[in-house]
Amino acid sequence: DGCKDIFMKNEILSASQPFAFNCTFPPITSGEVSVTWYKNSSKIPVSKIIQSRIHQDETWILFLPMEWGDSGVYQCVIKGRDSCHRIHVNLTVFEKHWCDTSIGGLPNLSDEYKQILHLGKDDSLTCHLHFPKSCVLGPIKWYKDCNEIKGERFTVLETRLLVSNVSAEDRGNYACQAILTHSGKQYEVLNGITVSITERAGYGGSVPKIIYPKNHSIEVQLGTTLIVDCNVTDTKDNTNLRCWRVNNTLVDDYYDESKRIREGVETHVSFREHNLYTVNITFLEVKMEDYGLPFMCHAGVSTAYIILQLPAPDFRAY
């Protein structure tokens, strides 16, 4: 059937709660493509009816919520003008018992995000909530060892928990909780995070790999909106920063007044041996001065750029 088969290296382990997976495969999904989800090699696509417990929402597959029987291999087929890619995603569902007193303690943490705080520094934890636009997430609450986190050293800022002057006592089992609303129904999302403390600061010795961009040019029409992802793989324990710069200045600072070009919020997916980070740059309106300028994605010591260029004139139109 002429598709390139691509398999995820890890199993995604999820609890009986809302779960979503986005079928993106950079840089394949950067052009015009169609995405269709299937389960267990079925020829029948996953429903697109939003009332269905499992349905496709744009490029996402959405489970509201996930159940035991949902374990299996899901395929998303990405069809482009001259290519087809079939991504195989293995989902395994298991029951989480967070702070159920009858169970006692926390669940098996095999699927938890592992995050690091740096001793003596001001640092942060991130609550990874990846859902399509149709899902509205309420404010996030943070817990440590089943107790809600309070205190002046801790500040909740959007999806992050800011921790000032990190101490050794900050290691342990954390959870972030949010209420997700979809089509008028509410669901609870609870993500666990195992936190360790390190004294190592700054550049962690790993060299991040920038998957995309690849030091290339992008043809884009004047006046259009453009979003470009920077996709980076790095070790799980890395302390590298990822950002977009232009003229050696952070884009958010460079375009501070007009806010015409902005850096997006970083997201990441956790894999067996590494993390895949994505941070995008958004051009609200491409202007003439943007052409020929290298927009640099930085990840630790690694860099890669894109250069915008005007499309070649299409003489067939004349």
């Epitope: 390139k4 894999f271 590494h274």
Partner: antibody, heavy 126, light 108 residues
């Protein structure tokens, strides 16, 4: 440095068996799919088989299916090719080669080969 | 299976020449095309992957282009060490991985 070293080649009679080995060093062996590729004297390259990074799947060229078995021992950083019922047309230099790590966090049934061994010669003759 | 056809089968050129080798797939393979160089008695060496990406350590005089069914390997200015056999290989529809029959580049 990143290296693959084949061994186990030799002269063998038709119908007999031979086992090739490929020792890897300088990279995390268990993260990569590995291929066997062969080249008959004076001929082009022919892909033989691939084994995925964790040994969970193997794929073979039609010409060797049912006769050759690819396997790996990640604890020993070693790849194997068990060749049974050998034929004269199996005479070739056999190379092991590392699959391109084109997609971090994902794997495929083979993308290309970025690191090659020096080759080991198998001659099938009566 | 996808067939890969290279042309020409052999080619004579001089140092400093610009050389082009083409590879055609029997069906669209998107950009899943790799190029290798092989010298007598040696293992092949990856030059270009994903149709146009230069493998680390390969001189910039080598370049690749194409998408779909038609692909090109170009050597902008031939050096003495470039005389070898070149193979294309598809990895779109696998298994099996398939190679072209090779192009032998000789000194004129």
């Amino acid at each position: 440095q990143v290296q693959l070293v084949e061994s186990g080649g030799g002269v063998v009679q038709p119908g007999k068996s031979l086992r090739l080995s490929c020792a890897a060093s300088g990279f995390t062996f268990s993260n990569y799919g590995i291929h066997w590729v062969r080249q008959a004297p004076g001929k082009g390259l022919e892909w033989v088989a691939i084994i995925l990074y964790d040994g969970s799947n193997q794929h073979y060229a039609d010409s060797v299916k049912g006769r050759f078995t690819i396997s790996r021992d990640n604890s020993k950083n070693t790849l194997y090719l068990q060749m049974n019922n050998l034929r004269a047309e199996d005479t070739a230099v056999y190379y092991c080669a590392r699959d391109l790590d084109l997609w971090s966090g994902y794997y495929t049934n083979g993308d290309g080969m970025d690191v090659w061994g020096q080759g080991t010669t198998v001659t099938v003759s009566s | 299976d996808i067939q890969m056809t290279q042309s020409p089968s052999s080619l004579s050129a001089s140092v400093g020449d610009r050389v082009t080798i083409t590879c055609r797939a029997s069906q669209s393979i998107s950009s899943y095309l790799n190029w290798y160089q092989q010298k007598p008695g040696k293992a092949p060496k990856l030059l270009i992957y994903a149709a146009s990406s230069l493998q680390s350590g390969v001189p910039s005089r080598f370049s690749g282009s194409g998408s779909g069914t038609d692909f090109t390997l170009t050597i902008s200015s031939l050096q003495p060490e470039d005389f070898a056999t070149y193979y294309c290989q598809q990895s779109y529809s696998t298994p099996p991985i398939t190679f072209g029959q090779g192009t032998r580049l000789e000194i004129k």
